[in-house]
């Protein structure tokens, strides 16, 4: 929970944040986990600690290892761990999987690619962007603040995008690169009035008191990427977040695209430790898009647990 993976390339800057968060006024001490040796705070060192941040300016392959951060309040010390790996620069263009940040998806209407980890650095615009190692040129590409915007996105725009920027520390400049994959969602399609596949209208769902129960709200909205489509649950006409019952939470399911190409969404309502009062609530599965809103209502009824004695006696 309080251990975090970080990675970078040799001869580039790498800044890592302590995964154990505290108040801004708390002090943070950093150590090499293997040796328990304190990491200096003096900025003249290549590797130094600066509050919640550990800075490698620049990083070396030998810096790889686990670093301990101890956040100290006036009365408590709490520990976090940063697992740092520094890799040699690749001679060829391919960026290996272990250097990739999370994949992002875009479409014609939303094509922002954020530069990973950039908020940790002292950088100035503009960012440089590369796709598959080629510098991006042309009016379709706009570097804006910490992200890249691609106009009129096409499926050919999918690929690995690298942002490159300069971190400045006390007048010295250090290069930083970060790469993530970009996928393009198919924009061709149509939109129609929501069709709720589950639950059925006025369905009665049997549940056992004291057990957990799941209700799935599943609806389809058309074909291809949908501009506005949502499924959600309401309790007695109130949003789950406003209802204020921590036992009852909704959790987005997978975006589904069935074999017929329909764009569908799931929302799972999880009820932990079902109570008698839950049987009195009205559960509404709502599906909405630009065409309108459709509602299916579900009620819970008590399922009598099987008496195993009567079966086996």
């Amino acid at each position: 929970k309080f251990s975090k993976q970080s990675w970078g390339l040799e001869n580039e800057a790498l800044i890592v944040r302590c995964p154990r968060q505290g108040k801004p006024s708390y002090t943070v001490d950093w150590y090499y986990s293997q040796t328990n040796k304190s990491i200096p705070t003096q900025e003249r060192n290549r590797v130094f600690a600066s509050g919640q941040l550990l800075k490698f300016l620049p990083a070396a392959v030998a810096d790889s290892g686990i670093y301990t951060c101890i956040v100290r309040s006036p009365t408590f010390n709490r520990t976090g761990y940063a697992n740092v790996t520094i890799y040699k620069k690749q001679s060829d263009c391919n960026v290996p999987d272990y250097l990739m940040y999370s994949t992002v998806s875009g479409s014609e209407k939303n094509s922002k690619i954020y530069c990973p980890t950039i908020d940790l650095y002292n950088w100035t615009a503009p960012l440089e962007w590369f796709k598959n190692c080629q510098a991006l040129q042309g009016s379709r590409y706009r570097a804006h603040k910490s992200f890249l915007v691609i106009d009129n996105v096409m499926t050919e725009d999918a690929g690995d995008y690298t942002c490159k920027f300069i971190h400045n520390e006390n007048g010295a400049n250090y290069s930083v690169t970060a790469t993530r994959s970009f996928t393009v969602k198919d924009e061709q399609g149509f939109s129609l009035f929501p069709v709720i596949g589950a639950p059925a209208q006025n369905e009665i769902k049997e549940v056992e008191i004291g057990k957990n129960a799941n209700l799935t709200c599943s609806a389809c909205f058309g074909k291809g990427t949908q501009f506005l489509a949502a499924v959600l649950w309401q309790l007695n006409g109130t949003k789950i977040t406003d209802f204020g019952e921590p036992r009852i939470q909704q959790e987005e399911g997978q975006n589904q695209s069935f074999s017929n190409g329909l764009a569908c969404l799931d929302m799972v309502l999880r009820i932990a430790d079902v109570k008698e009062e839950d049987l009195l609530l009205q559960y509404d599965c709502l599906a909405l898009n630009l065409h309108g809103l459709r509602r299916h209502t579900v009620r819970l009824s008590r399922k009598n647990p099987i008496d195993h004695h009567s079966i086996y006696c």
């Epitope: 929970k1 309080f2 968060q21 505290g22 309040s73 009365t75 408590f76 709490r78 520990t79 921590p246």
Partner: antibody, heavy 123, light 107 residues
Framework: EVQLLESGGGLVQPGGSLRLSCAAS????????MIWVRQAPGKGLEWVST????????YYADSVKGRFTISRDNSKNTLYLQMNSLRAEDTAVYYC????????????????WGQGTLVTVSS | EIVLTQSPATLSLSPGERATLSCRAS??????LAWYQQKPGQAPRLLIY???NRATGIPARFSGSGSGTDFTLTISSLEPEDFAVYYC?????????FGQGTKVEIK
């Protein structure tokens, strides 16, 4: 020195209301999460409610949700627990306590506790 | 909610003996577990936080260990003032929950 002093307890009939107060001193009250914990006679500890620091969210135990309201007045360094629709099972010593770490969206231990105030719900 | 089960319910020991108290969580709480001591008529006192760290002013004879679902509070050599009720508490998520307590009494 950190001090927490509860008041407002007493005897109340079922269905009645009470408002507990907790006066805090010796620390910057506004930045800390504050908590109510209760203990029925001869029983264990039960968390009742938490209010996050700096005007943050509130959290309640199932057993009191919809009946109890936690609030704070940072200008008065005071924590409150408004208890409505009281039941016999709410009879307990009510402690206020401080969460000394209290970052957004997380919880921690209770490092300072008051001495408690007894609430008795009986007809 | 996360249920914490403490064992034994009562521990009868003599001063100078070693006390081992157990706390088991119904699901993982990582190291987000604390131990408290409560004496009759008093508020609880924090002993251990983050499963194994002693709170300020707590004697070294108190130690905590464990991670995930199984935790132990050890009192290496019982002093007369250690006879009390001990509670574990998880704080990984709301609702915060306590164990039912272990009473350490004089044999």
């Amino acid at each position: 020195e950190v001090q927490l002093l509860e008041s407002g307890g007493g005897l109340v009939q079922p269905g009645g209301s009470l408002r507990l107060s907790c006066a805090a001193s010796g620390f910057t009250f506004s930045i800390y999460d504050m908590i109510w914990v209760r203990q029925a006679p001869g029983k264990g500890l039960e968390w009742v409610s938490t209010i996050k620091g700096e005007g943050g969210g509130t959290y309640y135990a199932d057993s009191v949700k919809g009946r109890f309201t936690i609030s704070r007045d940072n200008s008065k360094n005071t924590l409150y627990l408004q208890m409505n629709s009281l039941r016999a099972e709410d009879t307990a010593v009510y402690y206020c306590a401080r969460d000394p770490w209290s970052t957004e969206g997380s919880f921690f231990v209770l490092d300072y506790w008051g001495q408690g105030t007894l609430v008795t719900v009986s007809s | 909610e996360i249920v914490l089960t403490q064992s034994p319910a009562t521990l009868s020991l003599s001063p100078g003996e070693r006390a081992t108290l157990s706390c088991r969580a119904s699901q993982s709480v990582d190291d987000d577990l604390a131990w408290y001591q409560q004496k009759p008529g008093q508020a609880p006192r924090l002993l251990i936080y983050d499963a194994s760290n002693r709170a300020t002013g707590i004697p070294a004879r108190f130690s905590g260990s464990g991670s995930g679902t199984d935790f132990t509070l050890t009192i290496s050599s019982l002093e007369p003032e250690d006879f009390a009720v001990y509670y574990c508490q998880q704080y990984i998520t709301a609702p915060l929950t306590f164990g039912q307590g272990t009473k350490v009494e004089i044999k």
